[in-house]
């Protein structure tokens, strides 16, 4: 009896999560990613904001930049030049889109402990970076690229045609930033800093999305963004390379586009330097099932870049689009011509292949009914990658090492047995030559970051173990989480179920489905999170389920490409199927089932509510897409083709939320959107609202003035409070 009495008294001192806990970020965790500067050294910003250099081999650390210097210019970020002579300090951060921001930059000279005066950088700068060797600077100001040989030198202007919303040099336009490059920059230094490659995006002919930004003035401002929606005119991209040693000598040289790509609309997808005189460019047809990787060499005699047809490698998908979310990028071998790359094998699973002369002759390095996810590093004798192979759980990530310096190549899982219960989802960060690496474990237990020897894999030290978080959670009744699978009609539906702390299978609980469901996404992951749905389970006694249906990633092409050209069908069907299976489990109150989602999830939740199944009592859509004709070309056409009669217009029309307005009559619907959403335009929700009004269907709505797709800041608190009230009302839970 005693142990159970102790247990009960402990349980009495424990409390449920509150909404306040979530909104205050009380249970957020920290990760530690070393800022590697050599094989055995890294920089890190200490708790007191000093920039400290750590040497793993000597065990010594010293401050290279004091918090006083940081504070003197109000710096929120820094960057050390590779020759360790200068540091740039970044302040006045001003967010633009998902990755892009502008800032003011100051250069601090470490040799004399003073800021560089004379030829100061203009402000605000859109992007700035050091050369990989020495201390040259490249930066983008007012859509033009500038070069400095030394921080105190006058700048050399590389481009002159940059114009706001028209021509972008060295930075992407909106659609390339969000849907193709996933970066704020579009310039790349060669490994030793001899050349600088950059993209020029011409948005002159792109239609503009315009929306009001209300601000505090008498008249609202109009935000204009060149934004190609499905089927619209796209940016025209060109890639140039300039010799930074003698930039004025021949000027920027354009890199030729492969003929088979240039014959119709196309995209540039990524650039990878191989050596100072060899560069690899990846191109994609507008119909994104053909990708071409082109390896180009510098011709000293002509001072031009030559991309021979024999160095063009074509990747084509016959069952869907090329790649996963993006086409994978190559990791070059030390011979500077062959490379490793992830693409679908003959069985339809994404695996690492080694390509030398042709893609047809590729050697498959990994294989199995699982997927290789990322290649972290290739050295002379090892290849490090992540996959979801271990124990056949697609929502896990472990790090593997393949010994490629000997035959047969042997494979070792570096992380599988390190902290098996706590850590099942890893990423890694490697120093030069993979001498050392950091492992960052995201869960399912409390995240932990550790440092390891690159040769032996031995753990050297813990970098961050979130002790404070662990202590804070000691008296919290966290929900239980389980990850399992349903087998339905030859489809495996993995799900995560979040259960109230005192879950009792014999009782009935309200069910909330949280859905994203976008192509190549994954919601069912073995990661730690204390978030809104944790609170709903812990305090409000709800069961929450996340289901990865057709169209989701890392389980093979059959599941992934099932939604090709048919968005809005199977994703919704699979959520409904899962709900029916959950009801069969016996602990779900089938009169109290809700669904909610954000962005693509808002689209799926809307379609599920309007499916006419009678399964859902209520639901929420935050910033949903409502018609694929309203969304960005690069993303939408990848999965849907073009909205033209001879392509896929019919399904574009059939897959709108508006077409199902009548079906919302028997559900409680909460529609939410930010008016300054640059990504999924407010237009989407405006059209849903119009269709519902026209159909005389009652619904609830909330807009967030001047908020973008993230609904951040005070809007976040308001949003989650509002959604909580809505769900509690729907489920007849007392406030």
């Amino acid at each position: 009896l005693r142990p159970s009495r102790v247990h009960n008294s402990e349980e009495n001192t424990m409390r449920a999560l509150t909404l306040k806990d979530i909104l205050n970020g009380t249970f957020s965790y920290k990760t530690f990613f070393p800022n590697w500067i050599s094989g055995q050294e890294y920089l890190h910003q200490s708790a007191d904001n000093n920039i400290v250099l750590y040497n793993i081999e000597t065990g010594q650390s010293y401050t290279i930049l004091s918090n006083r210097t940081m504070k003197s210019v109000n710096a929120s970020n820094y960057g050390l030049s590779p020759d360790r002579q200068f540091v740039y300090l970044e302040s006045d951060y001003s967010k633009l889109w998902r990755y892009s921001y502008t800032a003011t930059y100051y250069i601090y000279d470490l040799s004399n402990g003073e800021f560089v005066r004379g030829n100061e950088l203009p402000r605000p700068i859109q992007y700035l970076c050091w050369s990989p060797v020495g201390s040259k600077l490249a930066y983008v100001y007012q859509n033009n690229i500038y070069l400095k040989q030394r921080p105190g030198d006058p700048p050399f202007q590389i481009t002159f045609n940059g114009r706001e919303n028209k021509i972008f040099n060295g930075i992407p336009d909106w659609v390339y930033e969000e849907e193709m490059l996933a970066t704020k920059y579009a310039l790349w230094w060669s490994p030793n800093g001899k050349f600088l490659a950059y993209a020029e995006f011409n948005d002159t002919d792109i239609p503009v999305i315009a929306y009001s930004y209300y601000g505090d003035e008498q008249y609202p401002r109009t935000i204009n963004i060149p934004y190609p929606k499905a089927g619209a005119k796209n940016p025209v991209v060109r890639i140039f390379i300039i010799d930074t040693t003698y930039p004025a000598y021949v000027g920027p040289q354009e890199v030729p586009v492969p003929a088979m790509i240039a014959s119709s609309d196309y995209y540039f997808s990524w650039l990878t330097w191989v050596t100072d005189e060899r560069v690899c460019l990846q191109w994609l047809k507008r119909v994104q099932n053909v990708s071409v990787l082109s390896i180009c060499d510098f011709r000293e005699d002509w001072q031009t870049w030559d991309c021979p047809k024999t160095q063009e490698h074509i990747e084509e998908s016959r069952t869907g689009w090329a790649g996963g979310f993006f086409v994978s990028t190559p990791v070059f071998s030390y011979d500077a011509i062959s490379y490793y790359k992830i693409f679908s094998d003959k069985d339809g699973y994404k695996h690492i292949h080694y390509i030398k002369d042709t893609v047809e002759n590729a050697i498959q390095i990994t294989s199995g009914k699982w997927e290789a996810i990322n290649i972290f590093r290739v050295t002379q004798d090892s290849l490090f990658y992540s996959s979801n192979e271990f124990e056949e759980y697609p929502g896990r990530r472990n790090i593997y090492r393949i010994s490629i310096g000997s035959y047969p190549p042997s494979k070792k899982c570096v992380t599988c047995h390190l902290r098996k219960e706590r850590c099942q989802y890893y990423t890694a960060s490697f120093s030069d030559y993979a001498k050392y690496y950091a492992l960052v474990c995201y869960g399912p237990g409390i995240p932990i970051s550790t440092l390891h020897d690159g040769r032996t894999d031995q753990e050297i030290k813990i970098l961050e173990e979130n002790k404070e978080l662990e202590n804070a959670l000691k008296n919290i009744q966290l929900p239980k989480e389980e990850i399992k699978k349903l087998e339905v009609d030859e489809i495996t539906l993995w799900y995560k179920m979040i259960l109230p702390p005192q879950f009792d299978r014999s009782k009935k609980y309200p069910l909330l489905i949280q859905v994203y469901g976008g192509p190549c996404s994954q919601s069912v992951r073995s990661v730690f999170a204390v978030n809104w749905i944790s609170y709903l389970a812990s305090k409000e006694g709800m069961v929450i389920a996340l289901v990865d249906g057709r169209g989701t990633a890392f389980q093979g092409d059959k599941l992934l490409y099932a939604v090709y050209r048919k968005l809005g069908v199977y994703e919704v069907e699979d959520q409904i199927t899962a709900v029916r299976k959950f009801i069969e489990m016996g602990f779900i109150d089938e009169k109290r089932i809700a669904i909610w989602g954000w962005s693509y999830g808002g689209y799926v939740s809307s379609l599920a509510l309007a499916s006419g199944t009678g399964l859902f009592k209520c639901g929420i859509a935050v910033a949903p897409v409502s018609s694929w004709e309203y969304y960005a070309s690069v993303y939408t056409e990848r999965f849907m083709g073009l909205p033209t009669k001879d392509d896929n217009l019919e399904h574009y029309k059939n897959s709108t939320v508006m077409a199902r307005a009548e079906y919302f009559r028997n559900v409680d619907y909460l529609l939410i959107h930010g008016t300054a959403d640059d990504n999924v335009h407010f237009q989407n929700s405006a059209q849903i609202a119009k269709a519902l009004v026209n159909a005389q269907v009652d619904f609830q709505a909330m807009w967030y003035s001047d908020q973008n797709h993230g609904l951040s800041g005070l809007s976040t608190n308001h949003l989650y409070t509002h959604m909580t009230h809505f769900l509690k009302q729907c489920f007849s839970l007392s406030d």
Partner: antibody, heavy 122, light 106 residues
Amino acid sequence: EVQLLESGGGLVQPGGSLKLSCAASGFDFSTYWMSWVRQAPGKGLEWIGEINPDSSTINYTPSLKDKFIISRDNAKNTLYLQMNKVRSEDTALYYCAGGYYRYPYYYTMDYWGQGTTVTVSS
Amino acid sequence: LVMTQSPASLSASVGETVTITCRASGNIHNYLAWYQQKQGKSPQLLVYNAKTLADGVPSRFSGSGSGTQYSLKINSLQPEDFGSYYCQHFWSTPYTFGGGTKLEIK
């Protein structure tokens, strides 16, 4: 000591068949890429084809693809060359060669047998 | 890919330095090997990766080149160096050989 010993050569009539063997010893045969190379009298070397350690990849010179078959038996440490529909121009000294794995993913022909002579004549 | 070796033959004296060249019809990216074959014997690997000496090969042999042009240099010829030399690429199948260079004593 590494040894490659070819056998099975001899006189064969045009249109006939012959199977050459190459017995390996002194190294881990099952981890080596193996090749066949031939040398016509007074001429240079001609690469016939290769086989990787687990026989999953076999490549041939295009002109010989349809008449020669390369195989191996790792349990017996033996490499084979099945020659079909031979003609007088197939008269040559046939070498087997074994290669170290060289990163990244290719091999070199480090070890050679002494060769076996095939004469095609009626 | 066609490998063109030159010269087809050359005469040299002991102690001299000779260079044999090999031209590929396309870029073979240093995937090149050199072999020596003495009369009545099997070929022997000298160089791989265009410039790496195989185990046990004397340092008077050296390989160089890139792209489509490669060469084998023999410094201070020794009596045992006379014979035939072949280049072979390993870029893509078929791994063709050059026509050979016969090195004779002058």
